[in-house]
Interface confidence: low
């Protein structure tokens, strides 16, 4: 058995056992999504660890239960993000809002999608059910990081600029007038994808397929694996989570929270001034008149804000913690226990990954009635079953009676909810 | 080539202590989990204790937990096993037996050993 | 504990499998040991299943699954004869275990 033996993978039988080999050696397990190598000694003995150290004890059950759990959120995820993405494409309705936000919004549920097509179908199969060996080649595994690096890139800086966009919007609408216009929005948008594409650099670089068969020869012992040392590769873990966690997150809990308290101060006077509020920074302000409904929605602003926040950090947060887990865990203090615990913490932090992917087009969509009555139509345009089932429109309402002495009135309170 | 040297057996007391070490050369004895395996008089191979690379984790044989220690010495390439409350059933031939990389310990995973020290416990 | 047989003969020539069955398990590793006399040093010819270090001639072969792993030797030499231990792990103990061994005999 393998004291310092795991996982992009999945769990380990249950424990009884305490020294259950490890998944994958930390090999996989930490590999996948992310990576990891088996830790300590694992660079002076890459082609001499034998090749059942890199099988992965994981009952059928447990197999079983991940795939069904990975296809749901699969299915959901992909037709959330491509109905968002084709709704955005094609709605002339929402393009012409003066807000830029639909082009955050398609650029999200591109990144999304990316994430659920390149990633998840691959870590099914070759982390979860065929642990090795690596079966897409040396190009497919220095790809495979690189794709889904850059896609987690874009995710959370797509998060991170919808915040941005959003406090623009809400906070400064005057200032959001001529920063964001289309031509802007559209580089900035491109500045990120650029961005995270060069950020996912180091992966192309970082990861290769090696053979750990006991004679580096064995076809069943290769393996995507770290080929650098790893005190490089712990850097190159620290980098991506503070570029693709820690920054985003700081980044969308300030802006929400200035939101929120933004958004709440509207509500407040709306109720003390006879539903009028102000909107505006500090140099130029103007008032609107906000039927009784909008303050609710304005309410439910505040709480979907929040539930983005929670959400980023829910989903992300365990995934990036399993991963710095081999930066700062040393080679004697992984314990059987702690292999225990970290092939189901594995499984755990991975679900949550795509169930971030999966979420995104309701957290940022379908909260808006408005979208959400253009997303069912859409949907019911693709989907002929959909479209019988739906007799008549699931949502309607009445359009804003959102009066003012400015233009960006009903766009600063209509998009508020994204 | 690995080299794995025994001493420390002998004629020993029921009751005593025995320490048994092992020197290694021939490898990065850092990099290597490190194994003890007895033999008994006209008997089979039995387990004794293991220890991985850094030394902070050991692993012991249940006929010998609780009495059993052993440790290593990177600087020195050694391995020592320290036994306790000696019996007559502990005589064996003992072999110091090298793990097969930094995560192996068990009887499954052991490939290369050393030629043993022999230790006869009698009153 | 590990089970073997405890002898087998082999033709000069021939094959032989030796198989270890019982509370160990594939997943943490079989090995296979070789001593020509009680009391020697014993010479790994398998380990972790299906290795073979790069000083055995490749007529030794391992396989495993399950709870059962198999030692293959094909084109039995004279010099072959030995006892056969396997070693593995028994998650009821957390222990290491070895198997009682089996005497290969070449006729």
């Known amino acids: 058995m393998r004291l310092n033996s795991s996982a992009p993978g999945t769990p380990g039988t249950p424990a009884a056992d305490p020294f259950q080999r490890a998944q994958a050696g930390l090999e996989e397990a930490l590999l996948a999504p992310g990576f990891g190598n088996a830790s300590g000694n694992a660079s002076e003995r890459v082609l001499a660890a034998p090749s059942s150290e890199l099988d992965v004890n994981t009952d059928i059950y447990s197999k079983v239960l991940v795939t069904a759990v990975y296809l749901a959120l699969f299915v959901v995820g992909t037709v959330g993000n491509t109905v968002t993405a084709f709704t955005l494409a094609r709605k002339k309705s929402l393009q012409s809002l003066q807000s830029t936000v639909h082009y955050h919004l398609g650029s999200l549920a591109l990144s999304d999608l990316l994430t659920l097509l390149l990633a998840m179908p691959v870590e099914l199969y070759n982390f979860i059910w065929v642990h090795h060996p690596w079966a897409f080649g040396d190009a497919g595994c220095r790809g495979y990081y690189f794709l889904r690096d850059a896609c987690t890139y874009a995710t959370a800086l797509n998060v991170a600029s919808l915040s941005v966009e959003r406090y623009l919007a809400i906070c400064h609408p005057f200032k959001a007038k001529t920063l964001m216009s289309r031509s802007r929005t559209k580089k900035f948008i491109s500045a990120i994808w650029l961005a995270s594409a060069l950020l996912a650099v180091p992966m192309l670089f970082t990861m290769g397929e090696q053979n750990r068969s006991a004679d580096g020869q064995h076809a069943g012992g290769l393996v995507c694996t770290p080929t650098i040392h790893t005190a490089t590769v712990k850097v190159v873990i620290q980098v991506n989570t503070f570029m693709s966690f820690i920054f985003p997150m700081v980044v969308i809990s300030v802006l929400n929270t200035i939101i929120a308290n933004k958004l709440t101060v509207m509500v407040r006077q709306a109720a003390e001034q006879g539903q009028v509020c102000t909107v505006g920074g500090e140099h130029s302000t103007f008032s609107m008149a906000i039927e009784p409904g909008r303050v609710q929605a304005l309410r439910h602003g505040v709480r979907v804000l929040r539930a983005v926040v929670i959400a980023f950090v829910v989903c992300w947060l365990p995934y990036h913690v399993r991963r710095l887990m081999f930066c700062y865990i040393s080679d004697e203090q992984w314990t059987p226990f702690l292999y225990d615990f970290y092939h189901y913490f594995y499984m755990v932090t991975n679900a949550l990954f795509y169930v971030s992917s999966t979420i995104n087009p309701i957290l940022y969509n379908l909260v808006s009635a408005n979208f959400r009555h253009i997303f069912l139509a859409t949907l019911a345009c693709l989907c002929p079953v959909w479209r019988r089932r739906r007799k008549r429109p699931a949502f309607s309402r009445k359009a804003d009676s959102v009066s003012s002495n400015h233009t960006l009135s009903s766009n600063a309170t209509r998009e508020t909810l994204y | 080539a690995v080299t794995l040297d025994e001493s420390g057996g002998g004629l020993q007391t029921p009751g005593r202590a025995l320490s048994l070490v092992c020197k290694a050369s021939?490898?990065?004895?850092?990099?290597?989990?490190m194994i003890w395996v007895r033999q008994t008089p006209g008997k089979g191979l039995e387990w004794v204790a293991s220890?991985?690379?850094?030394?902070?984790?050991?692993y012991y044989a249940p006929a010998v937990k609780g009495r059993a220690t052993i440790s290593r010495d990177n600087g020195q390439s050694t391995v020592r096993l320290q036994l306790n409350n000696l019996r007559a059933e502990d005589t064996a031939t003992y072999f110091c037996?090298?793990?097969?990389?930094?995560?192996?310990?068990?009887?499954?995973?052991?490939?290369?050993w050393g030629h043993g020290t022999e230790v006869i416990v009698s009153s | 504990a590990l089970t073997q047989p405890s002898s087998v003969s082999a033709n000069l020539g021939g094959t032989v499998k030796i198989t270890c069955s019982g509370s160990?398990?594939?997943?943490?590793?079989y090995g296979w040991y070789q001593q020509k006399a009680p009391g020697s040093a014993p010479v790994t010819v398998i380990?972790?299943?299906?290795n073979r270090p790069s000083n055995i001639p490749s007529r030794f072969s391992g396989s495993a699954s399950g709870s059962t792993a198999t030692l293959t030797i094909t084109g039995v030499r004279a010099e072959d004869e030995a006892v056969y231990f396997c070693?593995?792990?028994?998650?009821?103990?957390?222990?290491?275990?070895f198997g009682a061994g089996t005497t290969l005999t070449v006729l």
């Open positions: 070693g593995g792990y028994d998650s009821s103990t957390y222990a290491g275990i």
């Open positions: 021939g490898f990065t004895f850092s990099s290597f989990n």
């Open positions: 380990y972790d299943n299906t």
């Open positions: 037996a090298k793990s097969v990389d930094g995560v192996g310990w068990h009887a499954g995973q052991i490939d290369a």
């Open positions: 160990g398990s594939s997943w943490h590793g």
């Open positions: 220890i991985c690379t850094g030394g902070s984790y050991t």
